[in-house]
Interface confidence: low
């Protein structure tokens, strides 16, 4: 199997950002859990959330109320999360790490860009 994600996710300031992470597995493979972290170089990594196949979503205190699962229906191989109300400080690199059975662990990175729309008066 392999992880499918986007190299770059672009959202407008204030929008919800979908951080995609989908495990394209062979028949019978399962995703046990998905861990999301922010991994900007030089900043150290910061936990976002842990998505467990049995126990659901646990959000790190730093992101309480800001990380959710996409609305149903949900594919059990989909480890994507929503980052609510994106701000400029959210711009950076994110990593999902996926634990699968029986194939082992996989990881993928993406960059989140947050666009600020300036209003020009004529």
């Amino acid at each position: 199997g392999e992880l499918e994600t986007s190299d770059v996710v672009t959202v407008v300031l204030g929008q919800d950002a979908k951080l995609p992470c989908f495990y394209r597995g062979d028949s019978g493979e399962q995703v046990g859990q998905v861990a999301w972290a922010r991994v900007d170089a030089g900043e150290g990594a910061q936990e976002l959330a842990l998505l467990h196949s049995k126990y659901g979503l646990h959000v790190s205190p730093a992101y309480e109320g800001r990380v959710e699962q996409p609305p149903p229906p949900r594919n059990p191989l989909d480890g994507s999360v929503l980052l609510r109300n994106a701000v400029q400080a959210d711009e950076g690199e994110y990593e999902c790490r996926v634990s699968t059975f029986p194939a082992g662990s996989f990881q993928a990175r993406l960059r989140l860009r947050v666009l600020v729309h300036h209003h020009h008066h004529h």
């Epitope: 859990q33 972290a37 991994v39 910061q46 936990e47 126990y55 634990s99 082992g104 662990s105 990881q107």
Partner: antibody
């Protein structure tokens, strides 16, 4: 560095219960899975069950189902293992062990690898 | 339950020797395998996780390999402090199970 400190040795009568505690310090208690592993004198290691504090749900080995209860108190960063209906063959050293779901640097470990261990609690069952 | 079978159960070796311990799972466990070292009266210590990843602080003379059902722990040059009992453990499914242990003793 995570430290796990267990309660002291116990001597119990057959048929009674024992409750062993395991207090964690130096890490984020909610981020790891706590398991209990026992070792009878001169024998190997045997997993009894575990709990994930952030989810509050315990998972037990079938062998101990109905006789063991594992709980965790997030407010005090303490895990507990209670074993009932004790018999002589339960005489063993009982260890708590912690494995991260994700560690403080965000680098993910498959849970139930035991990065950290308590010092062990000897439980002797004797009439 | 997944059975973990270690061999040999006892191994006599000298300082400087290359030592290999094997662990076989009764069914495929991908790379969900750890190795521990235990000394008398002490708690086990994690050496290797995910079959081949060296735990932080563990000397590089320890290495792990394998996937599926067959796994190996190698000590490239045995040191005096390495005389101990070694256990493998699978974390593929619960109940988590350990091998019976391999005692590495002085020849």
């Amino acid at each position: 560095e995570v430290q796990l400190v267990q309660s002291g040795a116990e001597v119990k009568k057959p048929g009674s219960s024992v409750k062993v505690s395991c207090k964690a310090s130096g890490g984020t208690f909610s981020s790891y899975a706590i398991s209990w592993v026992r070792q009878a004198p001169g024998q190997g290691l045997e997993w009894m069950g575990g709990i994930i504090p952030i989810f509050g749900t315990a998972n037990y080995a079938q062998k101990f189902q109905g006789r063991v209860t594992i709980t965790a108190d997030k407010s005090t960063s303490t895990a507990y293992m209670e074993l009932s209906s004790l018999r002589s063959e339960d005489t063993a050293v009982y260890y708590c062990a912690a494995g991260y779901y994700y560690d403080s640097s965000g680098y993910y470990h498959q849970p139930y690898y035991f990065d950290y261990w308590g010092q062990g609690t000897l439980v002797t069952v004797s009439s | 339950d997944i059975q973990m079978t270690q061999s040999p159960s006892t191994l006599s070796a000298s300082v400087g020797d290359r030592v290999t311990i094997t662990c076989r799972a009764s069914q495929g466990i991908s790379n969900y395998l750890a190795w521990y070292q235990q000394k008398p009266g002490k708690a086990p210590k994690l050496l290797i996780y995910a079959a081949s990843s060296l735990q932080s602080g563990v000397p590089s003379r320890f290495s792990g390999s394998g996937s599926g059902t067959d796994f190996t722990l190698t000590i490239s040059s045995l040191q005096p402090e390495d005389f101990a009992t070694y256990y493998c453990q699978q974390s593929y499914s619960t109940p988590l199970t350990f091998g019976g242990g391999t005692k590495v003793e002085i020849k």
